[in-house]
Amino acid sequence: KETAFVEVVLFESSPSGDYTTYTTGLTGRFSRAGATLSAEGEIVQMHPLGLCNNNDEEDLYEYGWVGVVKLEQPELDPKPCLTVLGKAKRAVQRGATAVIFDVSENPEAIDQLNQGSEDPLKRPVVYVKGADAIKLMNIVNKQKVARARIQHRPPRQPTEYFDM
């Protein structure tokens, strides 16, 4: 379970049409459900219910986004449509280049993601909790344009990869 270094770049637009970028760093863990590799994409926030096998959404997504999913307390969904691993697979099937789960309210999900699948996903599946999860959700809840970059080593410079 290696450390995942996540950088989130938030874009704030000004009335003149220019963008100011804010970079926030946080850490999570690569789960065994996915690959330990780098990924980058625009953040798409998703409720876990939205990762059920519902074919009504097939037209909604392109490839290359990073799914951010805040898991609920298990008692809110006693009979989930899919396991957490199944939901990660569903996101990747829909075009996610990586999935980040906030497991703060469902810590049992960590074991589910780390059980080790015979057929792990070829994309990273990261989980965050505690202060890092709060930081991530504060950004995501702003509903602004944001990109996430996931790395398996600490970034050398927070903004080196971002070319305006």
């Epitope: 926030q45 409720h47 219910l49 009504d56 037209d59 392109e62 809110l76 344009v145």
Partner: antibody
Framework: QVQLVQSGAEVKKPGASVKVSCKAS????????ISWVRQAPGQGLEWMGR????????KYAQKFQGRVTMTRDTSTSTVYMELSSLRSEDTAVYYC????????????WGQGTLVTVSS | DIQMTQSPSSLSASVGDRVTITCRAS??????LAWYQQKPGKAPKLLIY???TLQSGVPSRFSGSGSGTDFTLTISSLQPEDFATYYC?????????FGQGTKVEIK
């Protein structure tokens, strides 16, 4: 903050068409579906259909199939709803609304466009 | 199409009252249910989605519960700004459909 700004009120004659625009700003345009919902005077809410801004895929309510067309212009982050063969019962406020965390749960709404159909 | 039935269609209540509105779907919609508040001349405002998840920025006096076909919106202590019309809406399958609305008036 995400904002959806709609075009102004329209008065149309029966049989005509109307095209309402909805310009998105302050958030990701391409990643969340935009729906159109209408509300006749003193009545409830009625979903007309939705468009996926990235792919342009549409789903329309059967009631409006053949009369409604939803399109988008990614260069201006704008979606459009055109309703043809207008009749008096199409007089309503038309809203565009954007998904938030969950498909079909609309956290962001335009201010509404009143379309009046009258001879 | 899935029919959504709200009750009551209107109710009178006082500031500080606990208010409960129910919504029933004609078939199971799992937890694909949202609640909206609408004031005259304004666009609806999302309060709850996924049956029980509070939308960011919505006061915690609003809560939702239910799964399958029966759902409830509760306002634990009614405030002056809560007098409005409330709608439930399913997004389990298209066409997405709304309840007919519940108007909460001042007693």
């Amino acid at each position: 903050q995400v904002q959806l700004v709609q075009s102004g009120a329209e008065v149309k004659k029966p049989g005509a068409s109307v095209k309402v625009s909805c310009k998105a700003s302050g958030g990701t345009f391409s990643s969340y579906a935009i729906s159109w919902v209408r509300q006749a005077p003193g009545q409830g809410l009625e979903w007309m259909g939705r468009i996926s801004p990235n792919r342009g895929g549409t789903k329309y309510a059967q009631k409006f199939q053949g009369r409604v067309t939803m399109t988008r212009d990614t260069s201006t982050s704008t979606v459009y709803m055109e309703l043809s063969s207008l009749r008096s019962e199409d007089t309503a406020v038309y809203y565009c609304a954007r998904d938030s965390w969950l498909r079909g749960a609309w956290g962001y709404w335009g201010q509404g466009t009143l379309v009046t159909v009258s001879s | 199409d899935i029919q959504m039935t709200q009750s009551p269609s209107s109710l009178s209540a006082s500031v500080g009252d606990r208010v409960t509105i129910t919504c029933r779907a004609s078939q199971s919609i799992s937890r694909w249910l949202a609640w909206y508040q609408q004031k005259p001349g304004k666009a609806p405002k999302l309060l709850i989605y996924a049956a029980s998840t509070l939308q960011s920025g919505v006061p915690s006096r609003f809560s939702g519960s239910g799964s399958g076909t029966d759902f409830t919106l509760t306002i634990s202590s009614l405030q002056p700004e809560d007098f409005a019309t409330y709608y439930c809406q399913q997004s389990f399958s298209t066409p997405y459909t709304f309840g007919q609305g519940t108007k909460v008036e001042i007693k």
